[in-house]
Interface confidence: low
């Protein structure tokens, strides 16, 4: 089903406008900002969500060490250009003709340049490391229970195939979730790890993108898992290209 037929809403994306103007009077939903039709049975792409967000009113040890090539989204929000499939265009520019190249999750991977900057291809982010610190609890969570619950969450709330959740690491109070998805592994219909990570990030921040569903109430054996800090690292199939000046 494309959207909820009864009251014509999009269960997986509240930043949409829906109306029964699809084939046969079916409910059809379009993303705010771009006006693109979205499939409400799965997650909406991060690019369309960012675009919708920018169009909305403004008030509205065993642990993994990130690789030297890991990117953190330091640039924050911007109004992205999305392709007809809703993916980020490889080159992004702002209103002052400053341009840069991004990866498949929309994070800048080159120095900023002018309109002559070339971005030959959209480089895929194939490894995402979600680094969480949870609030103090009476004791540490059981690792295997935590592992099972987080895998379950990604499968069921975000519809991400379990094979893409590579590992869950835990050293109280730090939790790390590793998502891995190579270009060759991603089949048609598979949720993209970048989209799943973005929905998760928004859920953790109490800004759920789901329509009408309550906020994320994550529990491990009944014990609430409350996150107080989130860091997300992105690793691309091709390392980013920054000048030495930035690296120092």
């Amino acid at each position: 089903h494309t959207a909820a037929q009864d009251n014509c809403t999009c269960p997986t994306n509240k930043m949409t406008v829906c109306s029964p103007d699809g084939p046969g009077g079916r409910c059809q939903c379009r993303a705010l900002g771009s006006g693109m039709a979205v499939d409400c049975s799965t997650l909406t792409s991060k690019c369309l969500l960012l675009k919708a967000r920018m169009s909305a009113p403004k008030n509205a040890r065993t642990l993994v060490r990130p690789s030297e090539h890991a990117l953190v989204d330091n640039d924050g929000l911007y109004d992205p250009d999305c392709d007809p499939e809703g993916r980020f265009k490889a080159r992004q520019c702002n209103q002052t003709s400053v341009c840069w190249c991004v990866n498949s999750v929309g994070v800048r991977r080159t120095d900023k340049g002018d309109l002559s900057l070339r971005c030959d291809e959209l480089v895929r982010t194939h490894h995402i490391l979600i680094d969480l610190r949870h609030r103090p609890t009476a004791g540490a969570f059981n690792h295997s229970d935590l592992d099972a619950e987080l895998r379950r969450l990604f499968r069921e709330r975000y519809r991400l195939h379990p094979k893409f959740v590579a590992a869950v690491h835990y050293e109280q109070p730090t939790i790390q979730i590793e998502l891995r998805q190579n270009t060759s592994q991603k089949a048609a219909g598979d949720v993209d790890i970048g989209d799943a990570a973005y929905y998760f990030e928004r859920d953790i921040k109490g800004e759920s993108l789901f329509q009408g569903r309550g906020g994320l109430d994550l529990r491990v054996r009944g014990e609430p898992l409350q996150v107080e800090r989130t860091l997300i690292y992105y690793l691309d199939e091709i390392p980013p290209k920054f000048s030495m000046k930035r690296l120092t």
């Epitope: 269960p11 059981n142 690792h143 295997s144 229970d145 592992d147 099972a148 895998r151 379950r152 969450l153 499968r155 069921e156 709330r157 519809r159 379990p162 959740v165 789901f210 569903r213």
Partner: antibody, heavy 123, light 107 residues
Framework: AVTLDESGGGLQTPGGALSLVCKGS????????MGWVRQAPGKGLEYVAA???????GYGAAVKGRATISKDTGQSTVRLQLNNLRAEDTATYYC?????????????????WGHGTEVIVSS | ALALTQPSSVSANPGETVEITCSGG????????YGWYQQKAPGSAPVTVI????KRPSNIPSRFSGSTSGSTNTLTITGVQADDEAIYFC???????FGAGTTLTVL
């Protein structure tokens, strides 16, 4: 090919204990949830217990508090211990493999079954 | 435990398409998951025909398919054959329960 071989069934006495073992082969045992499903004579299927790849466990209501599921990844075996046996525990017990690893809540995910081992609880 | 609802019996002529529905599974984070298990005779080992709503084990013919709409899952057998005559049980992810079974008779 995936094969699951159960052993340990037979005639048991009420109040006694039962230990069933399932040996898996033809797949990476450590990567998948495993469990037990039983079928009483003339009845439907009933979830008994399961254990995830991370060793998280789950139990059916009828055996909770009496059952323990465990696994030996090195031996590729999963074991079901059922104590305080009752006549209603009489059933064929099937070992079942999940198509996934990360959860012991798995009844919709079973992709392979053993041939079953018959357990009769009678005095 | 939640009770899964499926029809007690369905029948079809060879070559016809048959649908068996299953509903009543518990939702988890707003989604539902079902599996379908074929048993040729009571006491014989079940065989998985569909798991995780739509996935088909490699040894199962493509005439078996699964689909979900809301909280209901449907097992569809396209071009039913005499060999498909069996009891079909559905199973639900969150509740970890099975339906009572649907007997498929091929006329």
């Amino acid at each position: 090919a995936v094969t699951l071989d159960e052993s340990g069934g037979g005639l048991q006495t009420p109040g006694g204990a039962l230990s069933l073992v399932c040996k898996g082969s033809g797949f990476t045992f450590s990567s998948y949830a495993m469990g037990w499903v039983r079928q009483a004579p003339g009845k439907g299927l009933e979830y008994v217990a399961a254990i995830s790849s991370g060793s998280s466990t789950g139990y059916g209501a009828a055996v909770k508090g009496r059952a323990t599921i465990s696994k030996d990844t090195g031996q590729s075996t999963v074991r079901l211990q059922l104590n305080n046996l009752r006549a209603e525990d009489t059933a064929t017990y099937y070992c079942a493999k999940s198509g996934y690893g990360g959860s012991a809540s798995y009844v919709s995910d079973i992709d392979a079954w053993g041939h079953g081992t018959e357990v009769i609880v009678s005095s | 435990a939640l009770a899964l609802t499926q029809p007690s019996s369905v029948s079809a002529n060879p070559g016809e398409t048959v649908e068996i529905t299953c509903s009543g599974g518990g939702d988890y984070y707003g989604t539902y998951y079902y599996g379908w298990y074929q048993q040729k005779a009571p006491g014989s080992a079940p065989v998985t025909v569909i798991y995780d709503n739509t996935k088909r084990p490699s040894n199962i013919p493509s005439r078996f398919s699964g689909s979900t709409s809301g909280s209901t899952n449907t097992l569809t057998i396209t071009g039913v054959q005499a060999d498909d005559e069996a009891i079909y049980f559905c199973g639900s992810y969150k509740s970890n329960t099975f339906g009572a079974g649907t007997t498929l008779t091929v006329l």
